[in-house]
């Protein structure tokens, strides 16, 4: 019977997981007299694959970041090898996992900040890729500061934007940094995929060196 | 005195998932990070990840993801680390170690515990 | 990952010799390596920090040296109580990774 795994030679868009082994068929099309075999072409990789008899699988897992659309073309033909339905197109659409981790593009960032900079202004940002998808919670990345050194007295003096890795000065630390006093800061940063939300997130650390330095404009005087 | 007083050593079947602590004393507890290290063989050190009590947030070393959890209690100035679905791979010395806070000495292990025997075995 | 190699693996001295211990890092690292001692079942020691700076209540005979990827942990005259394993430490990037390590022994 027909259903959804059979019937007529038709354009179709069929959307497989990456990464999955192959464990059932995607379709088996149903020739049509004269049509006795069917033939595939386009962009197979070796991985997709017709039998003469219709049956289309595929034959190892799908890497999304390798190609994320598989575009095919199925045709129907007679005993004589004579293509007498299609081509018809065929579309594979791989669906992304969570299959790579974030990472930095730098071991190590170095950035230097003014005393008394305005909170909030980024002075420095680190960059993290993802080879997932963008477009799903497997690649969006989340920026977090895991430590400040030194702690002094806990009041963190740098922040980070969560979402595009922008480091600037808290409130605090635009009204506390002070060269003389203390003249470096390292900052120990992860970034988390799946927007940083779940158990099963890929992550990476980067360091950042930061020096304060002095605010060499004066208020006038009276 | 900076003290880290582990927990006492485990005897576990394979699958199994123990927790060790590591309780600080002598200083204040949110103003360092806590690194975990795991010693197989009586040799080899290897860096499991680090804990900031002071906000929670972590570092893993990507080799122990799915292996090893961290965590802290403020209030009884402990941190926490959870093994999972353990293996004979897992058995080895474990220690917690606390950062020097200086940025100048970048992640030096200034103190560490005593450490935590984890022996897997059927 | 940075990966650190230390040599040699065994070093066996006579009580007063001046030793000198390697750490190479696969790639340069400035001055952020670390060494540790660690004697039969103790926990490890932080002797030198940032290459060369000693810590607080060790012997003067140990000193460091180094900076980019070769570092050198020097006793200028070894005792007996010295002997152990000793660790270096990338202290540059993450994750942290140590060398496998030299075990000083006495003839």
């Known amino acids: 019977q027909e259903g959804k795994f059979s019937g007529p030679l038709k354009p179709m868009t069929f959307s497989i997981y990456e990464g999955q082994e192959p464990s059932q068929i995607i379709f088996q099309f149903k020739a049509n007299p004269p049509a006795v075999t069917f033939e595939l072409t386009g962009e197979t990789d070796n991985i997709f694959v017709i039998e003469r008899e219709g049956l289309l699988y595929y034959n190892r897992a799908l890497d999304r970041e390798t190609r994320s659309t598989h575009n095919l073309q199925v045709a129907a033909l007679d005993a004589n090898g004579i293509i007498v339905e299609g081509p018809v197109p065929i579309t594979i659409k791989v669906k992304d996992i969570n299959d790579n981790r974030p990472t930095f593009l730098q071991s190590k960032y170095e950035g230097s900040v003014r005393q008394n900079s305005r909170p909030g202004k980024p002075f420095l940002y680190v960059n993290a890729t993802d080879l997932d998808d963008p477009a799903t919670p497997n690649g969006q990345l989340y920026y977090q500061i895991v430590i400040q050194l030194p702690m002094i007295n806990n009041v963190m003096y740098f922040q980070i934007n969560n979402k595009t890795g922008a480091i600037s000065l808290t409130r605090e630390g635009s009204q506390e940094l002070n060269p003389a006093k203390n003249p470096s800061y390292n900052l120990v940063i992860s970034v988390k995929d799946m927007g940083g939300q779940s158990e099963n997130s890929f992550s990476d650390t980067t360091s950042v060196d930061i020096i304060v330095t002095e605010n060499i404009w004066k208020a006038p005087k009276p | 005195e900076v003290q880290l007083q582990q927990s006492g050593p485990e005897l576990v079947k394979p699958g199994a998932s123990i927790k060790i602590s590591c309780k600080a004393s002598g200083y204040s507890f949110t103003g360092y990070a806590l690194n975990w290290v795991k010693q197989s063989h009586g040799k080899n050190l290897e860096w499991i990840g680090l804990i900031n009590p002071y906000n929670g947030g972590t570092s893993y070393n990507q080799k122990f993801k799915g292996k090893a959890t961290l965590t802290v209690d403020k209030s009884s100035s402990t941190a926490y680390m959870e093994l999972l679905s353990l293996t004979s791979e897992d058995s080895a010395v474990y220690y917690c170690a606390r950062w020097d806070g200086n940025p100048h000495y970048y992640y030096a292990m200034d103190y560490w515990g005593q450490g935590t025997s984890v022996t897997v075995s059927s | 990952d940075i990966v650190m190699t230390q040599s040699p693996a065994t070093l066996s001295v006579t009580p007063g010799d001046r030793v000198s211990l390697s750490c190479r890092a696969s790639?340069?690292?400035?001055?952020?390596l670390h060494w540790y001692q660690q004697k039969s079942h103790e926990s490890p020691r932080l002797l030198i920090k940032s290459g060369s700076q000693s810590m607080s209540g060790i012997p003067s005979r140990f000193s460091g040296s180094g900076s980019g990827s070769d570092f050198i942990l020097s006793i200028n005259s070894v005792e007996p109580e010295d002997v152990g394993m000793y660790y270096c430490q990338n202290g540059h990037s993450f994750p942290l990774t140590f060398g496998g390590g030299t075990k000083l022994e006495i003839k």
């Open positions: 790639q340069s690292i400035s001055d952020y």
